[in-house]
């Protein structure tokens, strides 16, 4: 089941997703899509990273966190009711069926009052429960094009109320991550 996050119309929504690169420079491609994670890739891709960059995005979607250290949390700017729905964060670990997929449900509520202009980091998110998954031993190590050699040792995500980016970093540093390598 999806973890639920909430934001009001006109605010920025924040959907957390983290992993830990195996080594400096060894980034894993990540895609974000609107809709539940399919078997492969992301449907309706809104943002994508490769082994070094954000290499595709659509307007209003960006990574405000330290994505080169594995904070691939998605910010959606100035949300509307139409932004409600399920979003997929997919960590594209090389190897057959190694990808880690996270479905996050975004609920947009009408603004109670006319919102004042918000700073880019403003968001309101609710995280009602914790979801934890464990990897079953190391994944097969494969090399894919110019991607690094990686293996999967631990997978976990934490859903907890995030007040600001500093807390997001604290959570990541305390183990709210997918660890690779």
């Amino acid at each position: 089941s999806e973890v639920e996050y909430r934001a009001e119309v006109g605010q920025n929504a924040y959907l957390p997703c983290f992993y830990t690169p195996a080594a400096p420079g060894n980034l894993v491609p990540v895609c974000w899509g609107k809709g539940a994670c399919p078997v492969f890739e992301c449907g309706n891709v809104v943002l994508r990273t490769d082994e070094r960059d954000v290499n595709y995005w659509t307007s209003r979607y960006w990574l405000n966190g330290d994505f080169r250290k594995g904070d691939v949390s998605l910010t959606i700017e100035n949300v509307t009711l139409a932004d409600s729905g399920i979003y997929c964060c997919r960590i594209q670990i090389p190897g057959i069926m190694n990808d880690e997929k996270f479905n996050l449900k975004l609920v947009i509520k009408p603004a109670k009052v006319t919102p004042a202009p918000t700073r880019q980091r403003d968001f309101t998110a609710a995280f009602p429960r914790m979801l934890t998954t464990r990897g079953h031993g190391p994944a097969e190590t494969q090399t894919l094009g110019s991607l690094p050699d990686i293996n999967l040792t631990q997978i976990s995500t934490l859903a907890n109320e995030l007040r600001d980016s500093r807390l997001a970093n604290d959570l990541r540093d305390s183990g709210a991550t997918i660890r690779i390598g």
Partner: antibody, heavy 120, light 107 residues
Framework: QVQLVQSGAEVKKPGASVKVSCKAS????????MDWVRQAPGQGLEWLGY????????SYNQKFKGRVTMTTDKSTSTAYMELRSLRSDDTAVYYC?????????????WGQGTTVTVSS | DIVMTQSQKFMSTSVGDRVSITCKAS??????VAWYQQKPGQSPKLLIY???NRYTGVPDRFTGSGSGTDFTLTISNMQSEDLADYFC?????????FGGGTKLEIK
């Protein structure tokens, strides 16, 4: 200490190709990206692309796609940038620059620059 | 492509001044901005990476700030050796793009 030493100045005719080299020393060549940046006379800086020597992966600025090729020779820790079908507006100083993960792929070391003049 | 705009091409300063050079991105780039200093006939030198991290050996009078779309390089106590061109660069997404540069001159 880290050093990036580039090849000497080149004068080329329009339509020709140029290949600039950048020899790295003082660090593990395969652990860092090598980017190429150019600067036309009196102008700003323009990114051409990068190569990751460890895996050979490249990414080029679309503006130069089809005209630029970046390669490395790991045995000599040397990066190369070839630009083809030269035009007069390719006249510039070409720099290699090391993209470090710890500096978030900003450029902590630069070569001294290679002046490429395109003139008929 | 993400456009980086340095609106001030030239700035007149005096030794001891506090100088702020601004750079605006056409879309959010998080904190993925670097600042470089370039003196005539020399290669650029890295001053600030990831918006606010001072590179090794850079004097502490240089400070970077900002995130999202608006970034500032501040020189708190201008020295004669700081007369140079200053460029911002986004390294959020390729093609990496640079601002047009700001040249510091003496009044």
């Amino acid at each position: 200490q880290v050093q990036l030493v580039q090849s000497g100045a080149e004068v080329k005719k329009p339509g020709a190709s140029v290949k600039v080299s950048c020899k790295a020393s003082g660090y593990t060549f395969t652990d860092y990206y090598m980017d190429w940046v150019r600067q036309a006379p009196g102008q700003g800086l323009e990114w051409l692309g990068y190569i990751y020597p460890n895996k050979g992966g490249t990414s080029y600025n679309q503006k130069f796609k089809g005209r630029v090729t970046m390669t490395t020779d790991k045995s000599t820790s040397t990066a190369y940038m070839e630009l083809r079908s030269l035009r007069s507006d390719d006249t510039a100083v070409y720099y290699c620059a090391r993209g470090g993960y710890y500096s978030y792929y900003s450029y902590d070391y630069w070569g001294q620059g290679t002046t490429v003049t395109v003139s008929s | 492509d993400i456009v980086m705009t340095q609106s001030q091409k030239f700035m007149s300063t005096s030794v001891g001044d506090r100088v702020s050079i601004t750079c605006k991105a056409s879309q959010s780039v998080g904190n993925n901005v670097a600042w470089y200093q370039q003196k005539p006939g020399q290669s650029p030198k890295l001053l600030i990476y990831y918006a606010s991290n001072r590179y090794t050996g850079v004097p502490d009078r240089f400070t970077g700030s900002g995130s999202g779309t608006d970034f500032t390089l501040t020189i708190s106590n201008m020295q004669s050796e700081d007369l140079a061109d200053y460029f911002c660069q986004q390294h959020y997404s390729s093609p990496y793009t640079f601002g047009g540069g700001t040249k510091l001159e003496i009044k």
